[in-house]
């Protein structure tokens, strides 16, 4: 069985302020089981953008139906983009662990740049 890969196909995405940004991410396998999370930035100071398991993320919607048992698409859309949203976004697969899930593999990242709103 091939080891799971996290694929973020776009290195960069540019969006006008006020629009929505779609950040694409796909897995090549569902194994090992565990949640997907999206972060802005890397390292200890990274910001959680979306957690498949829990939490309320009002500006984030998933592009595909994550409750499908065979879903491999973990792309997200972030609404009402502002310049403060600029940065590099990472799609990260965790494997289940106790008491805490363990980071298993990260995508290469997608850099989001924000253009000025057209006048």
């Amino acid at each position: 069985e091939d080891e799971l890969q996290v694929i973020q196909p776009e290195k960069s995405v540019s969006v006008a302020a006020g629009e929505s940004a779609t950040l694409r991410c796909a897995m090549t396998s569902l194994i090992p089981v565990g949640p997907i999370m999206w972060f802005r930035g890397a390292g200890a100071g990274r910001e959680l953008i979306y957690n498949q398991k829990e939490g309320h993320f009002p500006r984030v919607t998933t592009v595909s139906e994550l409750t499908k048992r065979n879903n491999l698409d973990f792309s997200i859309s972030i609404s009402n983009i502002t310049p403060a949203d600029a940065g590099t976004y990472y799609c990260v697969k965790f494997r289940k662990g106790s008491p805490d899930d363990v980071e298993f593999k990260s995508g290469a990242g997608t850099e989001l740049s924000v253009r000025a709103k057209p006048s």
């Epitope: 089981v33 949640p35 398991k53 409750t67 499908k68 048992r69």
Partner: antibody
Framework: DVQLVESGGGVVRPGESLRLSCAAS????????MSWVRQAPGKGLEWLAG????????YYIDSVKGRFTISRDNSKNSLYLQMNSLTAEDTAVYYC???????????WGLGTLVTVSS | ALTQPASVSANPGETVKITCSGG??????YGWYQQKSPGSAPVTVI????KRPSDIPSRFSGSASGSAATLTITGVRVEDEAVYYC???????????FGAGTTLTVL
């Protein structure tokens, strides 16, 4: 409070059909996958089928595949189980259950009894 | 198939462990369900291996390692008498499976 209420059970003859319903309240039904689980008299729990939140994806155990169909109507906050070609082995209490993000169960209904007898 | 003991017994205040084996740790999440009488609604006491619903007492805990999951009741009470079912969700097959159930008797 999350509430799941099954209905539609009853006594039917072998070969007949029955449609079970599960009315959901207290949560955003359209955001959750759902399942049907049954318990035959004197037996343990048996998962039958699960359906994704939007209703486009369904899975079944082999013993009911082709006979049972799980469906949902998110506008009515309702889950259904259409059961065809029933046999005595389908006699059981049927529960609907809400799925967690990883397809286990967190809330259950009280169940509805289906009896298949000639 | 998931395998669990048919029965366990304990005195009030003792610690009870119920094991459930047969799943692949890398592809399986486990849950535990309490049923106080046949045909009554099951109650979820643990899901996602070790997550306890907010309305379940803290004496219930769960863990998983290797090919087995364990439900632990620390300081068991008479009202914990029930049948406990383990269940697994397998991410390879997309199928849920239940164990045959363990009858807990509190002496």
């Amino acid at each position: 409070d999350v509430q799941l209420v099954e209905s539609g059970g009853g006594v039917v003859r072998p070969g007949e059909s029955l449609r079970l319903s599960c009315a959901a309240s207290g949560f955003t039904f359209s955001s959750y996958a759902m399942s049907w689980v049954r318990q035959a008299p004197g037996k343990g729990l048996e998962w039958l089928a699960g359906i994704s939140a939007g209703g486009s994806d369904a899975y079944y155990i082999d013993s009911v595949k082709g006979r049972f169909t799980i469906s949902r109507d998110n506008s009515k906050n309702s889950l259904y189980l259409q059961m065809n070609s029933l046999t005595a082995e389908d006699t059981a209490v049927y529960y609907c259950a809400r799925e967690t993000w990883n397809h286990l169960f967190d809330y259950w209904g009280l169940g509805t009894l289906v009896t298949v007898s000639s | 198939a998931l395998t669990q003991p048919a029965s366990v017994s304990a005195n009030p205040g003792e610690t009870v462990k119920i094991t459930c084996s047969g799943g692949d740790w890398y592809s399986t999440y486990y849950g535990w369900y309490q049923q106080k009488s046949p045909g009554s609604a099951p109650v979820t006491v643990i899901h996602s291996d070790d997550k306890r619903p907010s309305d379940i007492p803290s004496r219930f805990s769960g863990s998983a390692s290797g090919s087995a999951a364990t439900l632990t009741i620390t300081g068991v009470r008479v009202e914990d008498e029930a049948v406990y079912y383990c269940a697994g969700y397998d991410g390879r097959t997309y199928i849920n499976t239940f164990g045959a159930g363990t009858t807990l008797t509190v002496l």
